[in-house]
Amino acid sequence: EEELQIIQPDKSVSVAAGESAILHCTITSLFPVGPIQWFRGAGPARVLIYNQRQGPFPRVTTVSETTKRENMDFSISISNITPADAGTYYCIKFRKGSPDTEFKSGAGTELSVRAKPS
């Protein structure tokens, strides 16, 4: 069984305020089954940005078609970026259970927000 890896290829992404940010995440295996979630920050204060199993998340869309049964691309686009969105974003695989439990995290992508060009 191939061990699941979570690949966040970009260490950092810089976006102008008002633009959209694309945060890339791919997984190398579908197993164990369970949802992908995105968070800003780490630890107890982290903020849920996207959860594959529930929604909607009005400013967040998935870049690829996640309803494909073999999909392994969980990149997201966040629209209308503001300075409050700055931080490190983690793509995390959960393993199914009651409740689902965190299985593996990507290394994180730091989002910085530039001033809106005048």
Epitope: L30, F31, P32, V33, P35, Q52, R53, Q54, E65, T66, T67, K68, R69, E70, K96, S98
Partner: antibody
Framework: DVQLVESGGGVVRPGESLRLSCAAS????????MSWVRQAPGKGLEWLAG????????YYIDSVKGRFTISRDNSKNSLYLQMNSLTAEDTAVYYC???????????WGLGTLVTVSS | ALTQPASVSANPGETVKITCSGG??????YGWYQQKSPGSAPVTVI????KRPSDIPSRFSGSASGSAATLTITGVRVEDEAVYYC???????????FGAGTTLTVL
């Protein structure tokens, strides 16, 4: 309220074709994968085919692969099942079902009866 | 193939458990579907192993561990008489499979 309404069933002869439709309402159809499930007289439920939300990927049980084609038209909120080379074994009630994020089912239509008889 | 008992029976108020075996916990999610008469529309009572739709009474619950899933009806009622089908989605094959169904009789 989520509603799924199948149509297109009827009586056909062996070897003939039939196209089933499923009209969806009450949810954002283009965001959900969909499936067809059938039930032969006196038998249990049998999953036949599923299709991703955008329609680019389809999946089939072996027994209908090559004879049945699942498709969708998101502009019309409609799901289809094209059935060719029908045999008596295809006699059943055919249901369309909305898929959950992990390809189980949450909502079902009332079904349409297909009878294959000479 | 998913295996479930052909029939179970219970008195009103009792707890009923219906098991479904044959899946792989590592790669399979389970759902449970109620059909009150042949040819009538199935109703989803549990999906994603243990998630109950908002319009389903709280007496229905689901769980999964190892290679089996369980549907539990706590305080069964006469109106729960039906055939219950388990289904699995296997992420290895991309295929959905149904069990043969369990007929619940409430005495």
């Amino acid at each position: 309220d989520v509603q799924l309404v199948e149509s297109g069933g009827g009586v056909v002869r062996p070897g003939e074709s039939l196209r089933l439709s499923c009209a969806a309402s009450g949810f954002t159809f283009s965001s959900y994968a969909m499936s067809w499930v059938r039930q032969a007289p006196g038998k249990g439920l049998e999953w036949l085919a599923g299709i991703s939300a955008g329609g680019s990927d389809a999946y089939y049980i072996d027994s209908v692969k090559g004879r049945f084609t699942i498709s969708r038209d998101n502009s019309k909120n409609s799901l289809y099942l094209q059935m060719n080379s029908l045999t008596a074994e295809d006699t059943a009630v055919y249901y369309c079902a909305r898929e959950t994020w992990n390809h189980l089912f949450d909502y079902w239509g009332l079904g349409t009866l297909v009878t294959v008889s000479s | 193939a998913l295996t479930q008992p052909a029939s179970v029976s219970a008195n009103p108020g009792e707890t009923v458990k219906i098991t479904c075996s044959g899946g792989d916990w590592y790669s399979t999610y389970y759902g449970w579907y109620q059909q009150k008469s042949p040819g009538s529309a199935p109703v989803t009572v549990i999906h994603s192993d243990d998630k109950r739709p908002s319009d389903i009474p709280s007496r229905f619950s689901g769980s999964a561990s190892g290679s089996a899933a369980t549907l539990t009806i706590t305080g069964v009622r006469v109106e729960d008489e039906a055939v219950y089908y388990c289904a699995g989605y296997d992420g290895r094959t991309y295929i959905n499979t149904f069990g043969a169904g369990t007929t619940l009789t409430v005495l």
